[in-house]
């Protein structure tokens, strides 16, 4: 590539008309500088010191009177207009002009496709002074042409703020076809048509395309580039490529794999991240996606207890973030969990079933049928109850917590008692006479304290009253019972 500077469009040339002369082209570079080494300043040979190169503008001796005689129009000599060569060959082309010695401060620059070639890559300007004119030959050489060197080259000379422009020299670098569009890898549905595109350019043109599937040519007759191959459908993975042919030879595109979308593989890992009494947090590593993005996943949960009815709970979730909290589980229960994910084709097989357990929780229900009565002879309150259903204990029962609140005129105090798990009755001492005692009971497991039963109230009279009847847990919707003895 060549360092370039943009220029606004300027009119062509100042001095129109036919100009005699010829331009030499030489495929041997005058100066061999590496193509990639950057651009050297233009090398110029001064008329006064012919053998010694220097850089900068050409200094031409001043003439005191420009009006002393009429000057001929200045123009670059005609040269070859079109050079065709193969990639990596060398090329050298010139433009030449004869400039009367009265002109001063002349500079020649090279331009390609409207952009100045700064640093004048491999450019040499030579001067051949005579009595009245100086012949200037500007040579441009490229040691190993590339496609990027294709284009229209011109010389420009500035004299007294006027610009003289040469005829263009078209450089056409020919080589093997160059792909501008290659087929792309695709994931396709089985037996569904799809298109592949291939485009290549010269020069030289035309470029013809052959398609190749799994190392065998698809089309017997070539198609002009660009070419679109319509594949009616595949049943298994295939590799496609295209061959681009021109007069210089053949270029083969990259081979692209066309995959057939399939159901995904099951997850390769499932992790139990955390368990609570009623939930299990799991994560998973998805398996192979079957060449189609995962859409969502399904977590299947069944009780591992052999006596369970074997029903499966299904929880659907998005494919990301491969994490799900399974809720609404029973406490202290064993579960089998399987994970399956789906893409547009269908569901994967379920992962191998894994085992997970919920932890103990606090009971979810209170003790039932709470009954309270006063035993005046011993000055105690007797409490009886039934333990909550096993299923709703949510763990191994370790005991009960009894709350009893004593209220009399202006005084209220709450006391808590702990009772071992074997009992279903308790006796508490009367704390205050002539007061109301409110009793509530909760079941306790290692997972915590469950809800308290509905309050049962009993009135404790002053000393000497007769023990009359028990108070018990009210039926739903009834007011709290208060037994006054």
């Amino acid at each position: 590539a060549i360092t370039e500077a943009r220029e606004e469009a300027k009119p062509y040339p100042l001095f129109p008309g036919p100009f005699p002369g010829s331009l030499q082209t030489d495929h041997t570079p005058l100066l061999s500088l590496p193509h990639a080494s950057g651009y050297q300043p233009a090398l110029m040979f001064s008329p006064t010191q012919p053998g010694r190169p220097h850089t900068g503008n050409v200094a031409i001796p001043q003439v005191t009177s420009v009006e002393s005689k009429p000057l001929p129009p200045l123009a670059f000599k005609h040269t070859v207009g079109h050079i065709i060569l193969s990639e990596h060959k060398g090329v050298k082309f010139n433009c030449s002009i004869s400039v009367p010695n009265i002109y001063q401060d002349t500079t020649i620059s090279w331009w390609k496709d409207g952009k100045e070639l700064l640093g004048a890559h491999h450019a040499i300007t030579q001067f051949y002074p005579d009595d009245e004119v100086t012949a200037i030959i500007a040579s441009f050489s490229i040691t190993s042409v590339q496609r990027s060197d294709n284009g229209s080259y011109i010389c420009k000379m500035k004299i007294n703020n006027e610009e003289i422009v040469s005829d263009p020299i078209y450089i056409e670098v020919q080589g093997l076809p160059h792909f501008t569009k290659q087929p792309e890898s695709m994931n396709v549905t089985r037996n569904t048509a799809f298109n592949l595109t291939c485009q290549a350019v010269g020069p030289p043109e035309p470029v013809n395309i052959f398609w190749v599937q799994n190392s065998s040519r698809v089309n017997e007759q070539p198609e002009k580039s660009p070419s679109v191959l319509t594949v009616p459908g595949l049943t298994e993975m295939a590799v496609f490529s295209c061959e681009a042919h021109n007069d210089k030879g053949l270029t083969v595109s990259k081979g692209v794999q066309i995959n057939i979308k399939a159901i995904p593989s099951p997850p390769t890992e499932v992790s139990i991240r955390n368990s609570t009494a009623h939930s299990i947090l799991i994560s998973w590593v998805p398996g192979f996606d079957g060449y189609s993005p995962f859409r969502n996943c399904s977590i299947q949960v069944k009780e591992a207890d052999p006596l369970s009815n074997g029903s499966v709970m299904i929880f659907n979730t998005s494919a990301l973030p491969h994490l799900y909290q399974i809720k609404q589980l029973q406490a202290l229960a064993n579960y089998s969990i399987g994970v399956s994910c789906m893409n547009e084709i269908g569901w994967s097989a379920v992962s191998p079933w894994i085992l997970a357990s919920t932890t103990e929780g606090a009971p979810s229900v209170a003790p039932l049928n709470v009954t309270v009565f006063l035993n005046e002879s011993s000055d105690n309150v007797d409490i009886r109850w039934m333990k909550p259903p096993t299923k709703q204990q949510d763990g191994e029962l370790v005991g009960y917590r009894i709350s009893h609140v004593w209220q009399s005129a202006g005084i209220s105090k709450e006391l808590l008692e702990e009772v071992g798990q074997n009992g279903s009755r308790a006796r508490i001492s009367v704390q205050v006479h002539n007061a109301t005692c409110t009793v509530r009971i909760a079941a306790v497991t290692r997972g915590g304290v469950g809800p308290f039963s509905d309050p049962v109230k009993i009135f404790i009279p002053a000393h000497g009253w007769v023990d009359y009847a028990p108070s018990s847990t009210p039926a739903p919707g009834n007011a709290d019972p208060v037994l006054i003895i």
Partner: antibody, heavy 128, light 111 residues
Framework: EQQLVESGGGLIQPGGSLRLSCAVS????????MSWVRQAPGKGLEWIGI???????YSASWAKGRFTISKDSSKNTMYLQMNSLRAEDTAVYFC??????????????????????WGQGTLVTVSS | DAQLTQSPSTLSASVGDRVTITCQSS????????LSWYQQKPGKPPKLLIY???DLASGVPSRFSGSGSGTEFTLTISSLQPDDFATYYC???????????FGGGTKVEIK
Amino acid sequence: EQQLVESGGGLIQPGGSLRLSCAVSGFSLSSNAMSWVRQAPGKGLEWIGIISSSGSTYSASWAKGRFTISKDSSKNTMYLQMNSLRAEDTAVYFCARVGFFVGYGAYDYGIIHRLDLWGQGTLVTVSS
Amino acid sequence: DAQLTQSPSTLSASVGDRVTITCQSSKSIYNNNWLSWYQQKPGKPPKLLIYDASDLASGVPSRFSGSGSGTEFTLTISSLQPDDFATYYCAGGYSGDSDYAFGGGTKVEIK
């Protein structure tokens, strides 16, 4: 094609260290757990340890302390670092893909379901 | 540590024979069925034959079958073929333990 290739085996003196590699192709170490298994000459298979897709490692009780499993997912390669080698460590060392793995993060253990793809193995000889 | 015991350790049989190998675990296998069977030929790595006690791995001929649950498992080759002479290993995992245990192996040789 899915493939496992072990390397790094050879003759090593007792007390020495060696690092074995298992180069994986055709699938990703970030999607699969991997395991090392060894087989002494003329003997049965012996499990060494596992590295999960996330990088958690679990080892056989006899291997803890001397053998360390690691991986470089960017290179799709798993390693087995073996220290303080003894004559009884002489064996062919296989790497294998874990077809499915369940991890119990809270309890720091995991269970292999199956080993569904094996490398050809690399021989380690511990001898003076 | 849990142990898997295979029997017999060596088995002589002829082509066409029905062959049965047993694998006994000292405690229940994880999920009662996470037991696999592997085939190994001399100088080669093991190859997965059966997983989940009875599921055939991909590409394994249907003459191989597995059964069992908990602690007792069986591998059966319904009609022994020349390619089946090899050593067979059972392997499995256990709850609460990362160790993956292999049985001692059963060598099936030509009678």
